[in-house]
Interface confidence: medium
């Protein structure tokens, strides 16, 4: 299963499969997740070790048993790969590191005014993997405001040094934020020239392209099909790069297929897994296990659940079958790809889905309406559960926010539907940041069912909660993921670090905002809240948030949106933006529906016919 806990002051002994320099434990964990054999990692921050060579060391580890002995090491951080962790799997890393210089090959230098602009330049440069920026207070005047774009053979820094007034970070291309755009075309009977960065075996060009997309130095590829004239080169996928970023030449060649990495695609990247099953094909590799199962799909599921399994072959040979079950060979290799691919067999083969991020796994997202006043712009993928509920009558307009809690479920406020109970007038937009990006061609979800709490009454503040069942399930992406729900009876007073988001008014008599706004707001006790709203009853099923002095709040248009808080290392949906006296007024906190109080109701309503809860819960 998915293991998310980190071990502080602990280092895993042995099992090393790779090592590199990373700026923090989270980036180290991401590299472990995408490494074909890494199950565990240990990271040494600068403060944990005097040995300069080992500072910022990230050690990727494998273990036949899935665990390794932990030794005490002050400052070290260890943990697990996020393989099998569904929507938590992402190669996107947004953090900027202050006082740190990430070294690599400096191939471009320019003057910019901010570190954000430097990161944007890196994201928009095809070869840039990471960058360093010298601030205006850097000790050497001639280097101030320099933005250095960098790459390295492995995609990670060749060294990391502590250096004052320098800020570093990574390209946001894996966040699907590149402005470059990508070539989706696959070119039949064409071979690309230039430098080979890696060679793997794949069953088709599409798997080759996905591997290229997630390889740090692959910009384009050539695949040799299973009927290529040279037998030893059949099914070979050559991952390639060039100085210019594009192939310097291409040659017409029968039975070859070429194409480009999709890392520079905007808004959508392929999943880092391969779900197709290949009938009549055997994948060779190191044997992990052999088990009898009923059908190739069960074989794939078995491989996915066994964390070390990378690919499988399901044999239909009579000697490999008994009754309705046949042998499922679970296999692995050094690079995650088969060591041999054979055609015309009585087997079917495929890959583990452990890196797929659409899985309905049970582990919570670990990131981080009436209206948002005093907030700041959000960035792409920062609040991937936030949705915009829009109404299309003669014109189309944003009315409310909502929170994605499962593939087919959105949680919002009941009052959003006051006077608009018809489901066919609603359009739900997910995975968006700017309302102005919505055009007639932008995909949206339609409503299958609106479930308003049975005790909600129009123009009353109580039970302001509603569920929306979407007509079709949504896939999870970098920008579209669910938020976890709390446990029943969670005490809101013990939450800290809470945020409200939405496109609502930025002042009381304002207008809907274009860019999704965010604001950090402290929770207020119900007793304190009741004092501020003496004409209303603040019930235990509500939670309040706001600053005594006002100035930051939700506002009109934020209703139904999320109030999320970090709780014991995980993010949870604590409240639904409901009501308040004006916006951001002094001593007038915002009032939110307390989600923990409605957990029974949510689970009852989201139960599918097979009794499985269809929302994102942490259990």
């Amino acid at each position: 299963g998915c293991l998310t806990q980190l071990y502080e002051n602990a280092f895993f002994r042995g099992g090393d499969v790779a090592s590199m320099y990373t700026p923090n434990a989270q980036y180290c964990q991401m590299r472990c997740t995408f490494h074909p054999r890494c199950l565990l990692f240990s990271f040494l921050p600068a403060s944990s070790i005097n040995d300069m060579e080992k500072r910022f060391g990230c050690f990727l580890k494998d273990s036949v048993t899935g665990t390794l002995p932990k030794v005490h090491r002050t400052g070290a951080v260890s943990g697990h790969s996020l393989k099998q962790c569904g929507h938590q799997i992402s190669a996107c890393h947004r953090d900027i590191y202050k006082g740190v210089d990430m070294r690599g090959v400096n191939f471009n230098v320019s003057k910019v005014s901010s570190v954000e602009e430097c990161q944007k330049r890196c994201t928009s440069n095809i070869r840039c993997q990471f960058f360093s920026y010298a601030t205006q207070t850097f000790h050497k005047a001639e280097y101030r405001n320099n933005c250095l774009l960098k790459y390295s053979p492995g995609g990670t820094p060749t060294a990391i040094k502590v250096l004052s007034n320098v800020e570093s970070g990574f390209s946001l291309k894996p966040c699907a934020l590149s402005e470059i755009g990508c070539h989706m075309n696959i070119f039949q009977h064409l071979a690309f020239s230039d430098v080979d960065v890696a060679r793997v075996l794949t069953p088709d060009a599409f798997v080759c392209r996905t591997i290229c997309t997630y390889h740090p130095n692959c910009l384009f590829f050539t695949f040799y099909t299973n009927v290529w004239k040279i037998e030893s080169q059949r099914n070979v996928c050559l991952l390639k790069t060039s100085e210019s970023g594009t192939p310097s030449s291409s040659t017409p060649q029968e039975n070859t297929i070429s194409g480009y990495s999709l890392l520079t695609c905007k808004r959508t990247l392929p999943e880092p897994c391969h779900s197709k099953i290949y009938p009549g094909v055997d994948f060779g590799g190191e044997e992990l296990n052999v088990t009898f199962v009923k059908g190739v799909n069960v074989c794939q599921e078995t491989c996915t659940k066994m964390i070390r399994c990378q690919f499988f072959t399901y044999s239909l040979l009579p000697e490999d079958c008994k009754e309705e079950k046949c042998k499922c060979f679970l296999r692995l290799s050094m690079d995650g790809s088969p060591t041999r691919i054979a055609y015309g067999t009585q087997g079917s083969s495929g890959y583990s889905l452990r890196l797929c991020n659409t899985g309905d796994n049970s582990v919570c997202t670990t990131k981080t309406s009436t209206r948002i006043v005093g907030g700041t712009n959000s960035s792409w993928g920062e609040w991937p559960w936030q949705v915009s509920l829009q109404v299309k009558l003669t014109a189309q307009r944003h009315l409310c926010g909502g929170s994605l809690i499962g593939h087919q479920w959105v949680l919002t406020a009941a009052h959003c539907f006051d006077g608009l109970p018809l489901q066919d007038v609603w359009r739900i937009y997910s995975g968006i940041l700017n309302l102005s990006d919505i055009t007639k061609d932008t995909p949206f979800s339609q409503i299958k069912e609106i479930i308003i709490h049975q005790n909600y009454k129009v123009s009353e503040g109580n039970h302001d909660i509603a569920l929306i069942k979407l007509q079709a399930p949504l896939n999870y992406t970098e920008f579209q993921k669910p938020i976890c729900l709390p446990s029943k009876g969670d005490t809101s007073t013990i939450y800290t670090n809470c945020w409200v988001t939405g496109w609502g008014f930025s002042k009381e008599k304002g207008e809907i905002q274009n860019i999704l706004q965010k604001v950090n707001i402290p929770l207020v006790t119900n007793e304190e809240c009741q004092k501020r709203y003496q004409d209303y009853k603040i019930t235990q099923r509500m939670v309040c948030a706001g600053y005594k002095e006002g100035g930051k709040d939700a506002c009109k248009g934020d209703s139904g949106g999320p109030l999320v808080c970090k709780h014991n290392g995980m993010w949870r949906l604590v409240g639904i933006t409901s009501w308040g006296e004006g916006c951001a007024r002094r001593e007038q906190p915002g009032v939110y529906t307390k989600v923990a109080e409605y957990m029974d109701w949510i689970l009852e309503k989201t139960q599918s016919s097979d009794g499985k809860a269809q929302m994102q819960s942490p259990a």
Epitope: S362, T493, A613
Partner: antibody, heavy 117, light 107 residues
Amino acid sequence: QVQLQQSGAELMRPGASVKVSCKALGYTFTDYEMHWVKQTPVLGLEWIGAIHPGSGGTAYNQKFKGKAIFTADKSSRTAYMYLSSLTSEDSAVYYCTRPYGYPFAYWGQGTLVTVSA
Amino acid sequence: DIQMTQSPSSVSASVGDRVTITCKASEDIYNRLAWYQQKPGKAPKLLISGETGLEAGVPSRFSGSGSGTDFTLTISSLQPEDFATYYCQQYWSTPWTFGQGTKVEIK
């Protein structure tokens, strides 16, 4: 690694009060709740409640309201549980425990409180 | 409050035996269940949770299953270090509550 160090055993008279301490090491004290659990041979493990050192917020099991009070000192990274009006029914081992998510992943070694005339 | 009922209260077994402990909740707890092991004079140790499954460092001979109100802890092949008391705990609804414990002793 995460460690929770509890104060030593206490022998108390009925009607007295006791303060049990729990020092947190190896993680950011203000980011995680500290929970308290009581263990007796008869009733087994019982959840008393929790404090969030970052916000000062508390949650109590109704059964222990008025009996237990939680506090936390950020500077010393220590959580305290104050038990008042002690009776023989309060004789137990008391544990502080820190969750990851919700389950209790880390435990102190326990503090034995004995109430006897 | 949700009541957690464990059975049996004790079990005698030998090294290599398969041991099964059950835990029944008085209402649906939506898989929010944890299992702990406790040895005499020591604090409980988290073995399995609904959130992350088997805890790091816990041998794979321990496994948890069940849903709704009925849950099971299985030790596939009992080892000498497994003789201890096992508790289940629900964290679906406050107050969090524990089962009364199952003592696994040497036959």
